[in-house]
């Protein structure tokens, strides 16, 4: 962008605002809430945008926990804290001291306690099972021509590589994406799956973060696939740590 | 060419409000951000919040948060910087800039006194 | 907050000779692309001057002898031969999130 386009915006992220005085005189888009500068060139990370999100509260998500180990997002909408390079702090505290650990999607995987609690290291989440229902259709979708696009989705509208989406299955009308990504597999440059997935689940709600694009259009061999619910479970590198009372609950 | 032009100087009592006026011109006043800065007397200066004009998205310093209150009128081309409840320690020169923070025009400042 | 620390508090120099300010953030304000560091001089009863943007852009305007440099979280701000309208105070300040935290000062004054 140059200082020329009167009206820079960022096709990333429209929890931006844009302006023409970044380095040289070209456009520089700012987080809302953080004012962070981001790079329109690739998707912003969660935190960032949950964030932004924070500054226009909307209706929190509440998700279901389906064992011991996979996490889901319960808690629902926070201001989260964010790190200098837009990633989650491993330790999170709300207005009232209460404090509790996150992992790298922003997830709580601890007890909540208070402003003594310690969170040594944000854990990576390296597994990401993205759980979806479509809405009837006509008959099965093909599951190779499924596979085939909706890595398609994630390689060409979220920039992930293909080789982090690990597997697509399909059980009409269910339809199962698996994203994994070690530390050690991410380079620099690489998008987070976790980040991925925000996006993928933001998009299936018609909630899209995209500038000025239309919302997801998905279609299988030019078929409307519909997503009517959408479940996300988080598995991290280290178990999470809950108290045997939250496990027996 | 661009100019921000503040309002005059301003004597108020504790616990009163002041409003500094910021009239921009000479760019398109809707694109860019405006900065608010403090300075106390013979002190550095202090980040007090922004506005950006074309959708009236603010940010504020937490330290002035609910008591500084950041406006745009852009019929009007003009920012404003309210603070509430003065106190003796307000007493300083505000600033208005036209910037994210590398603020590269600034009004020519009001100086704002409290004092009973 | 992103602290930022000026160094010296003030700097005498001779006319012609060369003067360095510092300014050390207390978390890096740099992306592999570009440094969120400004610096600005201001005048007694003038507004603040932006000198350099970015770290190491010299505003248009600004004389050449001023040159900005650092990355990460230290920066220095030289000027390569000292004129007597170089007398201010200058300060560094950030923008890589809120609130964009200005360093303490340093006033430069002539030996």
């Known amino acids: 962008h140059t200082a020329a386009q009167d009206n820079c915006t960022c096709p990333t992220n429209k929890m931006t605002v844009c302006s023409p005085d970044g380095p040289g005189g070209r456009c520089q888009c700012r987080a809302l809430g953080s004012g962070v500068a981001v790079d329109c060139s690739t998707l912003t990370s969660e935190c960032l945008l949950l964030k932004a999100r924070m500054s226009a509260p909307k209706n929190a998500r509440t998700l279901v926990r389906p064992n011991e180990h996979a996490l889901v997002d319960n808690d629902g909408l926070y201001d989260p804290d964010c790190d200098p390079e837009g990633r989650f702090k491993a330790r999170q505290c709300n207005q009232t001291s209460v404090c509790w650990c996150v992992n790298s999607v922003g997830v709580r995987r601890t007890d909540k306690g208070d402003l003594s609690l310690r969170c040594d290291e944000l854990v990576r989440t390296h597994h990401i099972l993205i759980d979806l229902r479509h809405r009837p259709t006509a008959g099965a979708f093909n599951h190779s021509d499924l596979d085939a696009e909706l890595r398609r989705l994630f390689r060409e509208r979220y920039r992930l590589h293909p080789k982090f989406v690990a597997a697509v299955h399909y059980e009409q009308p269910t339809i199962q994406i698996e994203l994994r990504q070690n530390t050690s597999q991410k380079a620099a440059g690489d998008v987070d799956i976790g980040d991925a997935a925000y996006y993928f689940e933001r998009d299936v709600k018609g909630e899209s973060l995209f500038q000025g694009r239309g919302g997801l259009d998905l279609r299988v061999r030019g078929e409307p696939l519909q997503v009517e619910r959408t479940l996300i479970y988080y598995l991290d590198e280290i178990p999470p740590k809950f108290s045997m009372k939250r496990l027996t609950a | 060419q661009v100019q921000l032009v503040q309002s005059g100087a301003e004597v108020k009592k504790p616990g009163a409000s002041v409003k500094v006026s910021c009239k921009a011109s000479g760019y398109t006043f809707t694109n860019y951000w405006i900065g608010w800065v403090k300075q106390a007397p013979g002190q550095g200066l202090e980040w007090i919040g922004d506005i950006y004009p074309g959708g009236g998205y603010t940010n504020y310093n937490e330290k002035f948060k609910g008591r500084a209150t950041l406006t745009a009128d852009t019929s009007a081309s003009t920012a404003y910087m309210e603070l509430s409840s003065l106190r003796s320690e307000d007493t300083a020169v505000y600033y208005c800039?036209?910037?994210?923070?590398?603020?590269?025009?600034w009004g020519q400042g009001t100086l704002v006194t409290v004092s009973s | 907050d992103i602290v930022l620390t000026q160094s010296p508090d003030s700097l005498a120099v001779s006319l012609g000779e060369r003067a360095t300010i510092n300014c050390r953030a207390s978390?890096?304000?740099?992306?592999?692309?570009?440094?969120?560091m400004h610096w600005y001089q201001q005048k007694p009863g003038q507004p603040p001057k932006l000198l350099i943007k970015y770290a190491s852009n010299l505003e248009s305007g600004v004389p050449d002898r001023f040159s900005g440099s650092g990355s990460g979280t230290d920066f220095t701000l030289t000027i390569s031969s000292l004129q007597a309208e170089d007398v201010a105070v200058y300060y560094c300040q950030h923008s890589w999130e809120i609130p964009y935290t200005f360093g303490g000062g340093t006033k430069l004054e002539i030996k």
């Open positions: 800039a036209r910037g994210t923070g590398g603020g590269d025009y």
């Open positions: 978390q890096s304000v740099s992306t592999s692309s570009y440094s969120y």
